[in-house]
């Protein structure tokens, strides 16, 4: 029978670490991490790490009992957890019978938004207590709410990941810019900022009709040439405060009728929000 892995939590040092080993298996040949989605009961879904590793193809694989994987996450708080994956059989060959290196994976470490993870793995038995053993590590940075997978998470939806304000902005005259956008029931307060290398105008927008989507309009006084300037719309939602997803548009000349026309180049930008 071919070896498989059985993984379980192991927070402390492995018991083998306390023992003296004359020989130890070699290091891992490769370690990779990618996010995968799994459905959860609440109708939301969770993002987990798929950690996969490749074993070195030589006879030292015969000593291999387990591989330990530890993950440290750094965002606004630090997390640390480890799993030990035991091999169910001794290795009878250095490569898979069908060809290629022995490759295994573990899916289970949860992934939070905008977090840097340090994933380390080493084979067991590992080096003796005062020796450096062979190990391998990789970094993985989880994406934020603008990611095509993450944006559908409830946390992100509440932060406006699916909201498209459809910003239009036009220069009415040398002193003013008219900004129009679609509001969202997620919040009722917004800030519109006009930038042309520096901030040339801004305005707070308060939209009392929070429960339905409406088209808001605001005329903003500017202190410089506004044509081609960037409009940045920052919403203030309860879940993310002043660090919600920001949206951008570009100021064009207003048509003669005074009605601003829609833009093609609306862009979104996360405001550095760490949920």
């Amino acid at each position: 029978r071919e070896p498989t892995v059985q993984c379980g939590s192991e927070t402390g040092p492995s018991p083998e670490w306390m023992l003296q080993h004359d020989l130890i298996p070699g290091d891992l040949r490769d370690l990779r991490v990618e996010p995968v989605t799994t459905s959860v009961a609440t109708g939301d879904y969770s993002i987990l790490m798929n950690v996969s590793w490749v074993l070195r193809a030589d006879a030292s694989i015969r000593l291999l009992k387990a591989t330990k994987i530890c993950v440290t996450g750094k965002s606004n708080f630090q997390s640390y957890s480890c799993v030990r994956c035991n091999y169910t059989e001794a290795f009878q060959t250095q490569t898979r019978p069908s060809g290629g290196k022995w490759t295994f994976s573990y899916i289970g470490f949860p992934v939070e938004l905008n977090t840097v993870y340090f994933i380390g793995a080493h084979n067991i038995p590992n080096a003796n207590m005062n020796e450096d053993g062979p190990s391998m590590s990789v970094n993985f940075t989880s994406p934020g709410c603008l990611d095509h997978i993450m944006k559908y998470k409830k946390k992100c939806v509440k932060a406006g990941s699916l909201w498209d304000p459809n910003i239009t902005a036009c220069k009415k005259n040398e002193e003013t810019v008219e900004v129009n956008f679609t509001t969202t029931p997620l919040g009722n307060r917004y800030m519109a900022l006009i930038q042309h290398s520096t901030i040339i105008g801004f305005s707070q927008v308060f939209e009392p009709h929070q429960k339905k989507q409406t088209r808001a309009s605001v005329v903003i006084p500017v202190t410089g040439d506004s044509e081609g300037a960037t409009v940045q719309l920052t919403p203030y939602f309860p879940t993310c405060g002043s660090d919600c997803i920001r949206h951008k548009g570009t100021v064009v000349l207003c048509p003669q009728t005074g009605v601003p026309f829609p833009l093609d180049n609306n862009k979104s930008k996360p405001g550095g929000w760490l949920p």
């Epitope: 193809a57 030589d58 030292s60 015969r62 060959t93 250095q94 490569t95 019978p97 060809g99 290196k101």
Partner: antibody
Amino acid sequence: EVQLVQSGAEVKKPGASVKVSCKTSGYTFISYWMNWVRQAPGQGLEWIGRIDPYDSEIQYNQKFKDKAILTVDTSISTAYMELSRLRSDDTAVYYCARSGGFDWFAYWGQGTLVTVSS
Amino acid sequence: DIQMTQSPASLSVSVGETVTITCRASENINSNLAWYQQKKGKSPQLLVYDVTNLADGVPSRFSGSGSGTQYSLKINSLQSEDFGSYYCQHFWRPPYTFGGGTNLEIK
């Protein structure tokens, strides 16, 4: 029946290169590492390196790192070893040898004599 | 790199005798050892792998033993076809190395 058939003897001048082939049959080529071993006249055996035909991972004996290049063509189940900047002390019989479950050499080619002479 | 020291370098014996060839590794190779026989002008042939396992078609008069750093190959009741060179090889971790060889000749 597992067979490893190597290309014929070669005579080369110093500084030249030579490419030795090892055509395999009778087993799944990508399932076993292929090793190359050298035996100078009247001398013992020296491991040159090995290649995994599955993904072309190569491991060399440091001594031969700048001398030998190992490649495979999985479409024709053939391994190759190219020797460059030949010198007279590269004169030897070169063998391909297929690994077993681990790196004991279960099957050997018939050997290719490479003679380097001016 | 692991050095393999083989002894004796040559041996002159008669048919029917028993011989033992030894191989010492410079460090523990955890029983990852093979023995080969090579006849003049021919390719080496696997005799024994994993210290004690005989390769297909190898007569039972050949036997291997040892562990750690010390290994040996024993040939009982030598036959005429057993004469030639014998090599040990470790396959613990690359780079793999062979012993210097033992030349077995007829007395």
